[in-house]
C-alpha cells in the first residue's frame, strides 16, 4: 500500500526520503551537544536545554512548539550537609564512611552542579543498627530470609545490591519488612562484564561508580501531591503525609568500593546458596550484624535531602495532519538526566531530535503526513515519569478520544549487540514489516535485513523464524499512555547479549561516567547503531502517521491472550483442590478470547475488502482499531494501583520494570496459598477472572461490525 | 607534566606546629587518595596519612594520631599535613603521593611522589 495516497504529495516524500534524510553524523553531533553539562529536572540548565530545543524544534519546521510547565514534588540532596553512611564503633565514633561524590570521568573534574549519588525521595533520618544482607531485595528473596531462614529484619539496617527489579519495590519489601533504612549497592557480578576494563578504559563500573535512582512506589500517580490531575497553577496539593508512593526509610545508594567495608565484617547466617553470592571478595554472610571482632560495631546512614515542589518543563512539538488532524502520532523521550545522560536518556534525544528534523525537511518540502504528528521533550522522568504523566492528565480527554499510538525514546542504547523491542500486539506486524525494509548495522550480517540479523540474535521462543518482542512494563515514560490510558504504545532501543552479560542493564547506569565518550570510544563509535534505532523509531511514526489504513493487526491480540489465559490457567491449576472446592472456573475467560479471535478473525477480513475511497468507512474501521486498545482499559483500574488501568498488561507488582499479563488476576493468585482467610483469596480470583472475561468480549465486541 | 610540590617545611620547636602543603599539577587530585609518607634520616620510609578523594575518610599513623591532620582543597588541588605538638622523633622528609587508585577507600600503592619537604623538631 503507498503511504502517499491521501495526502497528494509527490512519490518522492515517502517513508524512503524520511529514511534517507537520517543520518548518524548529525545524531553524533547532537549527542555531544546534550551531553556536555548536566542536566537535572528542575535545574536552569535544564530549562536552558527546554529552550534550545523548543527553538531548533522550530527552526527544523514544526508547525508549533510549546513548553508545558509544572510544579511537581523532586527531591535533592542538601548541598551543605550531605549523604553518606558510618561503621561506627561502640562509642559511636565513625570509623567509617562512605563517599561524598564519584570521582569525575577525565576532562569533566571543573564541572559545577554534579548532583552527589543519592535515592531520590529518601525520607530524612540518622538510623543506626545491625546489618542484614537481602540479595537482591526481592519478594522471593524476603520470603528465603523470613520463612526458610527464620531472620527477622524488623529494626535492622538492610543492604541490597542492585539489579533484577526496580529498586522501588526493593525498597517497598524493606519497609514491608520491617528495616529501619536501606543501603543500595552495585556488586561487580551486575555491573562489571568480565574481560572488560573499568571507565575511563572501558565501559565497566569503577569501584566509585554509583546508580542514582527514584525509589518511588507511584503505581502511575505521577506528581505524588496530584495525583489524578494535573499539577498546574491552581492544583490542590495533598500533604506531604498523603502523597502517593514515598518511601517511609531512609535509603542511600553505594558503590562497590564501599560496599566491600561493610560487606567484609557481616556475620550472623551464611548465604542460603551461591545466588545470593556476587563478586565481591566477601563472604556474602546474610547477618543481623558484624562477625565476632566486630559485633558491637553498627552500621548508621545520615540522610539530609528534601523534597521540593520544583517547576518543570516539556517541550511539545506539533506537525499537523493533511488528512486527520484529530488523529495523534506521538513520539516522545525524557531530556532531564542524573548527570550527563551519555546514554540515558541523551541517546535517545539525540535520536527524536533527528527525527524531528528529518520530518521537517520533508514539510519544507510541501509533504504533510496524514495524522498529526506530536513530538515530546519530556521533563522529570528520572524522578517518577512526572513530566510525561503531568502533561498526559492535562490532555486526558483529547488524548482518549485522539491518541492512535505512543513510541517512546528513552535511551537509544543498552548494548551493541541486537534490536529490542517492547510494544502492543497490535504493532507487531509493524515492526515485523518496518525491520525486513530495513539495513542490518550488525557486524556479520553486512547486506541483511534487520529483521534477519534480530531473529537471528533474539529470536521468539515461541514462533520459529520470528524475533522475541516483549511485554510493555513501566519504568519510562510510555506508562501513562499505554497503562492508563490504553493507547497503544511501543519502544525500541539496540541492546547487550542477555545471554553472555547477565549484569542488570548497562554497568554505568545512572552514574557520573555516562558520559558522550562513553558512547562515541565503546557502544557506538560510528553511531550506526543509534542511526538503526532512529529508522525503527522514526519508521513506526511515519507508517502510524501516514499510512491508509493503520498498521495494527488485530489478530496478534488474539494470539497472545490465547497464550497469556493458558499461561494464567496453569498458575492456578498448581492450586487443585482449591481450585475445586471454590469452584473456580477459567471457562468465563476461555470463552471471551476463543470470541476475540473470531472476530478478530473477521475484521481482518472486512479490512482486506472495504472501499478505502470511502472516507466515512475509512474512518470508522480505522476508529475500531485506534479504539481497540482503549477497550482494555478498565475504568475502574487495578486493585489498589488506579492509574493502573489495563487489563491484559500492568507493570508486575514485584518489578515496575517487567510486564504482567493478566494481572489482576496474577495478584490475586501469587502467594495465595499463605492468605489467611482462603476463602475470600480465591473469591478474589474468581472475580479478577470476571473481570478479565467481561474486557475481553466487551474489546471483542468493538471489532465487530457497527450495525 | 605530572608532578607534586611539597613546601612548608623547616626548623620548629618540640611542642610547636607546622604546616605542609603539596600542589599537585597535570593531574586532577579530585580523582585520587593522597598520602604523606616520611623518611627519618637514614631510616626507611614511613607511611604518616592517607586522605580520600573525597575527603570522607581519614587514616592516621598511630605515632601522629590526634597529633597530625590530612586535609585537602580539591578546587585548589593542594593537599595540606597540620602538624600539631611536633616531637623530635617527627624529624623527616616529608613526602606526598597519590594513590594509583581512582576513588580507593583505603590506601594502595603510590604512583607519583614528590621531593619532599625537610622537617626538623629541634630544641
Known amino acids: 500500500k503507498s503511504s502517499n495516497e491521501a495526502t497528494n504529495i509527490t512519490p518522492k516524500h515517502n517513508m524512503k526520503a524520511f529514511l534517507d534524510e537520517l543520518k548518524a553524523e548529525n545524531i553524533k553531533k547532537f549527542l555531544y551537544n546534550f551531553t556536555q553539562i548536566p542536566h537535572l529536572a528542575g535545574t536552569e540548565q535544564n530549562f536552558q536545554l527546554a529552550k534550545q530545543i523548543q527553538s531548533q524544534w522550530k527552526e527544523f519546521g514544526l508547525d508549533s512548539v510549546e513548553l508545558a510547565h509544572y510544579d511537581v514534588l523532586l527531591s535533592y540532596p542538601n548541598k551543605t550537609h550531605p549523604n553518606y553512611i558510618s561503621i561506627i564503633n561502640e562509642d559511636g565514633n565513625e570509623i567509617f564512611n562512605t563517599s561524598l561524590f564519584e570521582p569525575p570521568p577525565p576532562g569533566y573534574e571543573n564541572v559545577s552542579d554534579i548532583v552527589p549519588p543519592f535515592s531520590a525521595f529518601s525520607p530524612q533520618g540518622m538510623p543506626e543498627g545491625d546489618l542484614v544482607y537481602v540479595n537482591y531485595a526481592r519478594t522471593e528473596d524476603f520470603f528465603k530470609l523470613e520463612r526458610d531462614m527464620k531472620i527477622n529484619c524488623s529494626g535492622k539496617i538492610v543492604i541490597a545490591r542492585y539489579g533484577k527489579v526496580f529498586r522501588g519495590n526493593k525498597v517497598k519489601n524493606a519497609q514491608l519488612a520491617g528495616a529501619k533504612g536501606v543501603i543500595l549497592y552495585s556488586d561487580p557480578a551486575d555491573y562489571f562484564a568480565p574481560g572488560v576494563k573499568s571507565y575511563p578504559d572501558g565501559w565497566n563500573l569503577p569501584g566509585g561508580g554509583v546508580q542514582r535512582g527514584n525509589i518511588l512506589n507511584l503505581n502511575g500517580a505521577g506528581d505524588p501531591l496530584t495525583p489524578g490531575y494535573p499539577a498546574n497553577e491552581y492544583a490542590y496539593r495533598r500533604g506531604i503525609a498523603e502523597a502517593v508512593g514515598l518511601p517511609s526509610i531512609p535509603v542511600h545508594p553505594i558503590g562497590y568500593y564501599d560496599a566491600q567495608k561493610l560487606l567484609e565484617k557481616m556475620g550472623g547466617s551464611a548465604p542460603p546458596d551461591s545466588s545470593w553470592r556476587g563478586s565481591l571478595k566477601v563472604p556474602y554472610n546474610v547477618g543481623p550484624g558484624f562477625t565476632g571482632n566486630f559485633s558491637t560495631q553498627k552500621v548508621k546512614m545520615h540522610i539530609h535531602s528534601t523534597n521540593e515542589v520544583t517547576r518543570i518543563y516539556n517541550v511539545i512539538g506539533t506537525l499537523r495532519g493533511a488528512v486527520e488532524p484529530d488523529r495523534y502520532v506521538i513520539l516522545g523521550g525524557h531530556r532531564d538526566s542524573w548527570v550527563f545522560g551519555g546514554i540515558d536518556p541523551q541517546s535517545g534525544a539525540a535520536v527524536v531530535h533527528e527525527i524531528v528534523r528529518s520530518f521537517g525537511t520533508l514539510k519544507k518540502e510541501g509533504w504533510r503526513p496524514r495524522r498529526t504528528i506530536l513530538f515530546a521533550s519530556w521533563d522529570a522522568e528520572e524522578f517518577g515519569l512526572l513530566g510525561s504523566t503531568e502533561w498526559a492528565e492535562e490532555n486526558s480527554r483529547l488524548l482518549q478520544e485522539r491518541g492512535v499510538a505512543y513510541i517512546n525514546a528513552d535511551s537509544s542504547i543498552e548494548g551493541n549487540y541486537t534490536l529490542r523491542v517492547d510494544c502492543t500486539p497490535l504493532m507487531y506486524s509493524l515492526v515485523h514489516n518496518l525491520t525486513k525494509e530495513l539495513k542490518s548495522p550488525d557486524e556479520g550480517f553486512e547486506g541483511k535485513s534487520l529483521y534477519e540479523s534480530w531473529t537471528k540474535k533474539s529470536p521468539s521462543p515461541e514462533f520459529s523464524g520470528m524475533p522475541r518482542i516483549s511485554k510493555l512494563g513501566s519504568g519510562n515514560d510510555f506508562e501513562v499512555f499505554f497503562q492508563r490510558l490504553g493507547i497503544a504504545s511501543g519502544r525500541a532501543r539496540y541492546t547487550k547479549n542477555w545471554e553472555t552479560n547477565k549484569f542488570s542493564g548497562y554497568p554505568l547506569y545512572h552514574s557520573v561516567y555516562e558520559t558522550y565518550e562513553l558512547v562515541e570510544k565503546f557502544y557506538d563509535p560510528m553511531f550506526k547503531y543509534h542511526l538503526t534505532v532512529a529508522q525503527v523509531r522514526g519508521g513506526m511514526v511515519f507508517e502510524l502517521a501516514n499510512s491508509i489504513v493503520l498498521p495494527f493487526d488485530c489478530r496478534d491480540y488474539a494470539v497472545v491472550l490465547r497464550k497469556y489465559a493458558d499461561k494464567i490457567y496453569s498458575i492456578s491449576m498448581k492450586h487443585p483442590q482449591e481450585m475445586k472446592t471454590y469452584s473456580v472456573s477459567f471457562d468465563s475467560l476461555f470463552s471471551a478470547v476463543k470470541n476475540f479471535t473470531e472476530i478478530a478473525s473477521k475484521f481482518s477480513e472486512r479490512l482486506q475488502d472495504f472501499d478505502k475511497s470511502n472516507p466515512i468507512v475509512l474512518r470508522m474501521m480505522n476508529d475500531q482499531l485506534m479504539f481497540l486498545e482503549r477497550a482494555f482499559i478498565d475504568p475502574l483500574g487495578l486493585p489498589d494501583r488506579p492509574f493502573y488501568r489495563h487489563v491484559i498488561y500492568a507493570p508486575s507488582s514485584h518489578n515496575k520494570y517487567a510486564g504482567e499479563s493478566f494481572p489482576g488476576i496474577y495478584d490475586a493468585l501469587f502467594d495465595i496459598e499463605s492468605k489467611v482467610d482462603p476463602s475470600k483469596a480465591w473469591g478474589e480470583v474468581k472475580r479478577q477472572i470476571y473481570v478479565a472475561a467481561f474486557t475481553v468480549q466487551a474489546a471483542a465486541e468493538t471489532l465487530s461490525e457497527v450495525a | 607534566e605530572v608532578q607534586l610540590l611539597e613546601s612548608g617545611g623547616g626548623v620548629v620547636q618540640p611542642g610547636r606546629s607546622l604546616r605542609l602543603s603539596c600542589a599537585a599539577s597535570?593531574?586532577?587530585?579530585?580523582?585520587?587518595?593522597m598520602n604523606w609518607v616520611r623518611q627519618a634520616p637514614g631510616k626507611g620510609l614511613d607511611w604518616v596519612a592517607f586522605?580520600?578523594?573525597?575527603?570522607?575518610?581519614?587514616y592516621y599513623a598511630d605515632s601522629v594520631k590526634g597529633r597530625f591532620t590530612i586535609s585537602r582543597d580539591n578546587s585548589k588541588n593542594t593537599l595540606y599535613l597540620q602538624m600539631n605538638s611536633l616531637k623530635p622523633e617527627d624529624t623527616a622528609v616529608y613526602y606526598c603521593?597519590?594513590?594509583?587508585?581512582?576513588?580507593?577507600?583505603?590506601?594502595?600503592?603510590?604512583?607519583?611522589w614528590g621531593q619532599g619537604t625537610m622537617v626538623t623538631v629541634s630544641s
Open positions: 603521593a597519590k594513590d594509583r587508585i581512582v576513588g580507593a577507600r583505603v590506601p594502595d600503592a603510590y604512583d607519583i
Open positions: 597535570g593531574f586532577p587530585l579530585i580523582s585520587y587518595g
Open positions: 586522605i580520600t578523594y573525597d575527603g570522607s575518610n581519614r
